[in-house]
Interface confidence: low
């Protein structure tokens, strides 16, 4: 049986070497000489020769300093043989434990640790964690028992101890109120890790803490008073630019300004934000009316896109907006005036008065009237009063100038502002009909063939309106009925049929036709009839001398 006491060997021993560790014995040595040997790691396998054994005495020796952090345990096998070389014992496993010395400093896992914390964070808020390791034995010794401390804080403001570190875990937390990104955006901590629970070997690392932004600063108007001018009647005109400063992080929702007009019930103004520099651009949302109000005093508040994180006073500005008077065109009342007038209205008489109002009530301007479009030259206007009279006879049946019984004239009113302004009104004269047109035949030139002539239809035209038109009455006069007959072609008597009573010689004839309208207005018209050398429907005729009263006139 083997007699092997527990074996441990401190690392980093000084020597001299070899140095006795323990004496191995087999109780077979009572029976005869026993020779000892060892095998295994550190004996006959790498690292070879770290351990040796005195062949005859069994003293196990170490030949060099050990390094626990390289090999913490050696497993060897002891062998015992008799003088003839026969084994007297089965091999025995020997465990050699290398005991730890505090020969390793803690080492941080990073040279620089980065963390962040929101400004205004309350004490107890966790910021970040730093971690260090130690190669020494942390099971049986305190050689790797690391304690963390903060050695320094830069800047030491507003308090030199803004943060604390958990000695055991390395978690850094806020310990003091007053973190303010706008004052101190970063903190640099030098942190230490020391073994032996803080009493041993130590090392340092840097923890950089970024203080992140919250909306703890309001946008502030600078200046707080503005003036601007804007011409009346113009929308979307820039009046002035409002300037704000915000200490929060630029181009973030905590910095971006939102402008509100506090006293713009009519929605006449709007403030937009310039995304580049956060300025407020005050514009008109709709045209302003100088005659109603010449000055606006606006109160504008500014906040941020996101709510304030703390209780903050909202900055306000006063903007005085002066409305500038613009010379506005006179306005006709109504813009289009309809007047009914008989077409036989007397020349030189006043038809109507058509006037304009001056929007620029303060200016007490004089308005001058003139006719701008009067295609038939029928009208004239009093330049001071706007009274419109006839200068010539009206004619409803002047179809070049009158459409649907309506004559359209354009009137302009010009003020004496600077610059002058001109307004336009439309005058519609609705011309009522007078029976001033007798019926006329259409066509007036008619062709017949000498042989087998075909009757011809003649339409009766009257430019007037009912009841000054059909039914018409037709009558041949001046002896025309001797050679010709007429009869009505339709119940309304708006056309007649003309045909010869007998065969006629080739030549030209004149027929007098009297036509009368429903109101007995009549007119005699001469029809020019050509009898042609043809049969049936008339073709092209040679010219001949006319024949009066339907009788041929000798050449």
């Amino acid at each position: 049986d083997w007699v092997i006491p527990p074996i441990s060997c401190p690392e980093n021993e000084k020597g001299p070497f070899p140095k006795n560790l323990v004496q191995i014995k087999s109780n077979k040595d009572k029976e005869g000489k026993v020779f000892y040997s060892i095998t295994g790691q550190g004996a006959d396998t790498p690292p070879v020769g770290v351990f040796i054994i005195e062949r005859e005495t069994g003293w196990l020796k170490v030949t060099e300093p050990l390094d626990r952090e390289r090999i913490a345990t050696y497993t060897l096998f002891s062998h015992a043989v008799s003088s003839n070389g026969n084994a007297v014992e089965d091999p025995m496993e020997i465990l050699i434990t290398v005991t730890d010395q505090n020969d390793n400093k803690p080492e941080f896992t990073q040279e620089v640790f980065k963390g962040s914390v929101m400004e205004g964070a309350l004490p107890g808020t966790s910021v970040m964690e730093v971690t260090a390791t130690d190669a020494d034995d942390d099971v049986n010794t305190y050689n790797a028992a690391i304690a963390y401390t903060i050695l320094s804080q830069d800047p030491e403001l507003p308090d030199k101890n803004m943060f604390t570190i958990n000695r055991n875990t390395g978690v850094i937390s806020v310990v003091t109120t007053g973190l303010d990104r706008e004052s101190f955006p970063t903190y640099t901590l030098v942190v230490q890790a020391a073994d032996l629970q803080g009493e041993g070997l130590s090392t340092t690392a840097t923890a950089v803490i970024t203080v992140t932004d919250t909306n703890d600063n309001p946008p502030i108007f600078n200046p707080t008073t503005y003036k601007g001018q804007v011409p009346e009647n113009e929308a979307n005109v820039v009046i002035t630019t409002l300037k704000v400063t915000d200490a929060d992080a630029p181009n973030t929702p905590a910095w971006e300004a939102v402008y509100t007009i506090l006293n713009d019930d009519g929605g006449q103004f709007v403030v937009t934000t310039n995304p580049v520099n956060n300025d407020g651009i005050l514009k008109t949302a709709k045209g302003l009316d100088f005659e109603a109000k010449q000055q606006y005093i606006l109160h504008v508040a500014v906040t941020n896109v996101v709510p304030f994180e703390v209780s903050l006073t909202t900055s306000t500005a006063t903007v005085t907006v002066d409305v500038l008077d613009v010379n506005e065109a006179p306005i006709f009342v109504p813009p289009e005036k309809r007047v009914e007038v008989s077409e036989d209205f007397g020349v030189g008489q006043e038809i109507t008065s058509y006037t304009a109002q001056e929007p620029d009530t303060f200016m007490e301007q004089k308005i001058t009237y003139r006719i701008w479009r009067d295609t038939a030259n029928w009208l004239e206007i009093n330049p001071d009063t706007g009274a419109i009279s006839t200068r010539a006879e009206l004619d409803r049946e002047d179809f070049e100038h009158v459409k649907n019984s309506t004559y359209t004239a354009l009137i302009i009113a010009t003020d004496n502002g600077s610059p002058v302004a001109t307004g336009t009104g439309t005058l519609l004269l609705i011309l009522s009909d007078v029976n001033d047109n007798a019926p006329i035949p259409e066509p007036r030139t008619i062709f017949f063939c000498e042989r087998n002539p075909k009757p011809q239809v003649i339409n009766i035209i009257d430019a007037d309106l009912p009841p000054n038109t059909s039914p018409f009455t037709a009558e041949l006069t001046h002896g025309a009925s001797a050679n010709w007959t007429i009869q009505y072609n339709d119940p309304t008597q708006e056309s007649i049929i003309l045909k010869p009573k007998m065969a006629l010689e080739v030549g030209d004839y004149k027929i007098n036709l009297k036509l009368m309208d429903n109101q007995n207005k009549d007119q005699v018209t001469t029809l020019e009839v050509s009898v042609c050398d043809c049969e049936g429907a008339a073709g092209v005729c040679r010219k001949a001398q006319p024949v009066e009263a339907g009788l041929q006139i000798p050449a």
């Epitope: 109603a292 109000k293 010449q294 006063t318 002066d322």
Partner: antibody, heavy 123, light 113 residues
């Protein structure tokens, strides 16, 4: 000629309301704005507010919650009403016409004033 | 609000003397768009309502004697009476109409010796 004349109650009890009428002649209220100014005894002038020709109003922000200015163009009258009077509202109250400029460069001084009406707040 | 400060608060002069009184505003009353100063001067005689003397800092109101002159720009303004008459006994107020609320100075009381 242009004239403005204020008429008021003279004596008002604390916490009560004050109503003053300014009757004008010689100009149209639809065209000119009217301002109100007061003067405590032995003290300086304080601007109260104004009403524009179109009827809109502007007020001294410190008094806005207690002040109402209105008018009746057809009667040529402007009205000032002030609520919750205290003793420090004791003053002479003036109405005044605002200057007008053709082409208007903005900004308004007061070219015609009423003679004022004395208001005493006392129980 | 714009604060208007007048000095002196009171002064006594003899008839015929030249008088100047000062008015300072807490911010500029000069509007860059039209280069006008939004300041007026009023005269208030004892027992009377105020009377407009000067507007736009230097423009005399119609009917005001030419011995009254307004000057200055920005924040510093002066009313000068070139030769005081007995009838000029009054309190003189400056008034800004640059922005609402319109405000007045505390007044300068002109007494005649």
């Amino acid at each position: 000629q242009v004239q403005l004349k204020e008429s008021g109650p003279g004596l008002v009890a604390p916490s009560q309301s004050l109503s003053i009428t300014c009757t004008v002649s010689g100009f149209s209220l639809s065209r000119y704005s009217v301002q109100w100014v007061r003067q405590p005894p032995g003290k300086g002038l304080e601007w109260l507010g104004m009403i524009w020709g179109g009827g809109s109003t502007d007020y001294n922000s410190g008094l806005k919650s207690r002040l109402t200015i209105s008018k009746d163009n057809s009667k040529s009258q402007v009205f000032l009403k002030m609520n919750s009077l205290q003793t420090d509202d004791t003053a002479m109250y003036f109405c005044a016409r605002t200057q007008f400029y053709y082409g208007h460069d903005g900004g308004y001084a007061m070219d015609f004033w009423g003679q004022g009406t004395s208001v005493t707040v006392s129980s | 609000d714009i604060v208007m400060s007048q000095s002196p608060s009171s002064l006594a002069v003899s008839v015929g003397e030249k008088v100047t009184m000062s008015c300072k505003s807490s911010q500029s009353l000069l509007y860059s768009n039209n280069q006008k100063n939004y300041l007026a001067w009023y005269q208030q005689k004892p027992g009377q309502s105020p009377k407009l003397l000067i507007y736009w800092a230097s423009t005399r109101e119609s009917g005001v004697p030419d011995r009254f002159t307004g000057s200055g720009s920005g924040t510093d303004f002066t009313l000068t009476i070139s030769s005081v008459k007995a009838e000029d006994l009054a309190v003189y107020y400056c008034h800004q109409y640059y922005t609402s609320p319109y405000t007045f100075g505390g007044g300068t009381n002109l007494e005649i010796k």
